[in-house]
Interface confidence: low
């Protein structure tokens, strides 16, 4: 009998649901993996892939109702010719709580000594038209904003921004300002991922002189 995959787990972002597993020890070139999915409430395992040689599988298309369902469990077993292992099942229920929150993009512009930021929620192509980030997380959205100034030896963090827009009064400072954003939903336990850094340069020309 083949050994079972040691572990199976989901890594998910908004409408990007990837199942991962660790390979069995001493697998051969002909070893592949079978993937099955259980939707809570149905009581039935559905075969998704009979023979995947990769160590991950994109289950987004078959879990599109994740955000409006009771969740899923997945299982994986090794297959080598006519031999197969026991199933290894994900330890936890894959539900909305397991989705890591991300932002789509962060846009920065300069206006009269202020840096104005606009956070664009993720807009994955796979998401059904009615399932936007804002409709699924309709309340208690927050963003943590980390700002770094170059040159200058400080960073600072603006916490609890409750809107997709934010502003920074620069008090006459000039230089390059780099911003990262991490989303959260205060009523939920989802982890958030820091966005890639966006930078904007502020020079004297951006300040209006007032008497």
């Amino acid at each position: 009998e083949l050994p079972s995959p040691p572990s199976v787990w989901f890594e998910a972002e908004f409408f990007h649901h990837i199942l991962h597993w660790t390979p069995i020890p001493n697998q051969s070139e002909s070893t592949c993996y079978e993937v099955a999915l259980l939707r809570y409430g149905t009581g039935r395992w559905n075969s998704i892939s009979n023979c995947s040689q990769a160590l991950s599988y994109d289950l987004t298309a078959v879990t599109l109702d994740l955000y409006r369902s009771n969740g899923y469990r997945a299982r994986v077993r090794a297959v080598d010719g006519s031999r197969h292992s026991n199933w290894t099942v994900t330890n936890t229920r894959f539900s909305l709580d397991e989705v890591t929150l991300t932002v789509g993009s962060v846009k920065l512009e300069i206006h009269n000594g202020f840096i104005l930021g606009k956070i664009q929620p993720p807009r994955p192509k796979m998401a059904p038209a009615n399932d936007t980030y804002e409709s699924i997380f309709s309340h208690f959205r927050e963003y943590e904003i980390a700002i770094r100034k170059v040159p200058g030896n400080f960073t600072f963090t603006h916490k609890k921004v409750k809107h997709e827009n934010f502003s920074l009064l620069t008090s006459g400072e000039v230089g390059e300002f780099c911003v990262q954003v991490k989303p959260s939903v205060t009523s939920r336990t989802n982890k958030g991922m820091w966005s890639k850094e966006e930078c904007v340069s502020l020079t004297r020309q951006y300040f209006t002189v007032t008497n």
């Epitope: 400080f154 963090t157 603006h158 920074l168 620069t170 008090s171």
Partner: nanobody, 127 residues
Framework: ELQLLESGGGLVQPGGSLRLSCAAS????????VGWFRQAPGKGREFVAA????????YFGDFVEGRFTISRDSSKNTLYLQMNSLRAEDTAVYYC????????????????????WGQGTLVTVSS
């Protein structure tokens, strides 16, 4: 007049933790941006952390690297600095300070923006 009194300093081993407190008296500092600076022997004052009047915004010096957290309890008129993973180079006198403004601005990274200062509490990190 706003008076500030720090406490919680002392001797701690590298890797240890301390929690500094700053109690305000004379009047409430709930409408002030408040923060912590430090001064190591033979060096100038260095910005550590600050928090705005409503607690929505925090700032940290680069050297903090996620080791410190700043918080305030307006009902107790007290400011806190929780310091974890302390290093020998964190040895300094730590000062509590209060500014008069509320707007989130880079000016609060400069000691000249702070009108009120405490007497300081000494933190020594040594084995």
């Amino acid at each position: 007049e706003l008076q500030l009194l720090e406490s919680g300093g002392g001797l701690v081993q590298p890797g240890g933790s301390l929690r500094l407190s700053c109690a305000a008296s004379g009047r409430t500092f709930s409408s002030h941006t408040v923060g912590w600076f430090r001064q190591a022997p033979g060096k100038g004052r260095e910005f550590v952390a600050a928090i705005t009047w409503n607690g929505d915004t925090t700032y940290f010096g680069d050297f903090v690297e996620g080791r410190f957290t700043i918080s305030r309890d307006s009902s107790k008129n007290t400011l806190y600095l929780q310091m974890n993973s302390l290093r020998a180079e964190d040895t300094a006198v730590y000062y509590c300070a209060a500014a008069t403004g509320q707007v989130w601005s880079l000016q609060y990274l400069r000691e000249s923006s702070y009108a009120y200062w405490g007497q300081g509490t000494l933190v020594t990190v040594s084995s």
